[in-house]
Amino acid sequence: YDFTNCDFQKIEADYLRTISKDLITYMSGTKSTDFNNTVSCSNRPHCLTEIQSLTFNPTPRCASLAKEMFARKTKATLALWCPGYSETQINATQAMKKARKSKVTTNKCLEQVSQLLGLWRRFIRTLLKKQ
């Protein structure tokens, strides 16, 4: 999906209002210095591309993020503010259904969510730079 035509201001507002709080809740008990951020993003479409991939693509070390509250809200936000996004997400929905039902938060999932927080923060910063 090409995120170029999204309403970035509306996505920022949704992130600051709800998604960020859910991510921080997920990370509760860990320090920001516990994990080294190894990925970043260049501009707003790039940030959303990587956020979407990291949130919804199960990885061998962390298969369950797609079922978390922040992931559901991310999906709703992208569907709302990115034209045509919903139609591209049939595969992602299947991935969510296949994701483990276990609610165990592994260290690797915490690390992945730490990376996500970094990508979202970069998204906000690139937005501020453009204004």
């Epitope: 993003c41 991939s53 990885t59």
Partner: antibody, heavy 117, light 108 residues
Framework: QVQLQESGPGLVKPSETLSLTCAVS?????????WSWIRQPPGKGLEWIGY???????SYNPSLKSRVTISRDTSKNQFSLKLSSVTAADTAVYYC??????????WGQGTLVTVSS | EIVLTQSPATLSLSPGERATLSCRAS??????LAWYQQKPGQAPRLLIY???SRATGIPARFSGSGSGTDFTLTISSLEPEDFAVYYC??????????FGQGTKVEIK
């Protein structure tokens, strides 16, 4: 200390597919970062080809997108480049590199691929 | 596509002298710029990222400055091992990351 090592044929015929592999040691490619390919024609500058991230997202240089495929094999801790329909203009030293999806902090030593019949 | 123009193409200096290399972008890249050093037969090495942050293990004599469209790499006092080709790279314009054409720093 991460180390990267390119391998593959040094000579490819025009119109065929160039295939290279980058073996990574000292770091798991499924643990973090992105894993990128960059090339440098003899005596010329650098051109970014694309990357695959540790979680599987892939991004390509638009000028090469129609001909490029980057994939990975996490069990062997390596990633690969395929470039189809090559011409003499694809003759270059091909580097693999670790990236944070922005810039490139560790590089392989490079492998020269010549396109010639 | 953002075009990066490096100048001069060649810089002839003696060890101990100060080197000032320029990289100009065809449009603003904010501070999304990196510098690399490449010696003959070797891979490039990251020197500077985010326009002014030194990469791990890079000596303090290397410094980067600039924002927007004009950037400078300064080598405060050239060591014999610093004679090489230097490239700038912008990462503001995903998915079209581009490099400059390079500046060769040679011994006078």
């Amino acid at each position: 200390q991460v180390q990267l090592q390119e391998s593959g044929p040094g000579l490819v015929k025009p119109s065929e597919t160039l295939s290279l592999t980058c073996a990574v040691s000292g770091y798991s490619i499924s643990s973090g970062y992105g894993w990128s390919w960059i090339r440098q024609p003899p005596g010329k500058g650098l051109e970014w080809i694309g990357y695959i991230s540790y979680y599987g997202s892939i991004s390509y240089n638009p000028s090469l997108k129609s001909r490029v495929t980057i994939s990975r094999d996490t069990s062997k801790n390596q990633f690969s480049l395929k470039l189809s329909s090559v011409t003499a203009a694809d003759t270059a030293v091909y580097y693999c590199a670790r990236t944070n999806l922005l810039y490139f902090d560790s590089w392989g030593q490079g492998t020269l691929v010549t396109v010639s019949s | 596509e953002i075009v990066l123009t490096q100048s001069p193409a060649t810089l002839s200096l003696s060890p101990g002298e100060r080197a000032t290399l320029s990289c100009r972008a065809s449009q603003s890249v904010s501070n999304n710029l990196a510098w690399y050093q490449q010696k003959p037969g070797q891979a490039p090495r990251l020197l500077i990222y985010d326009a002014s942050s030194r990469a791990t293990g890079i000596p303090a004599r290397f410094s980067g400055s600039g924002s927007g469209t004009d950037f400078t790499l300064t080598i405060s006092s050239l060591e014999p091992e610093d004679f090489a080709v230097y490239y700038c790279q912008q990462y503001s314009d995903w998915p079209q990351y581009t490099f400059g054409q390079g500046t060769k720093v040679e011994i006078k």
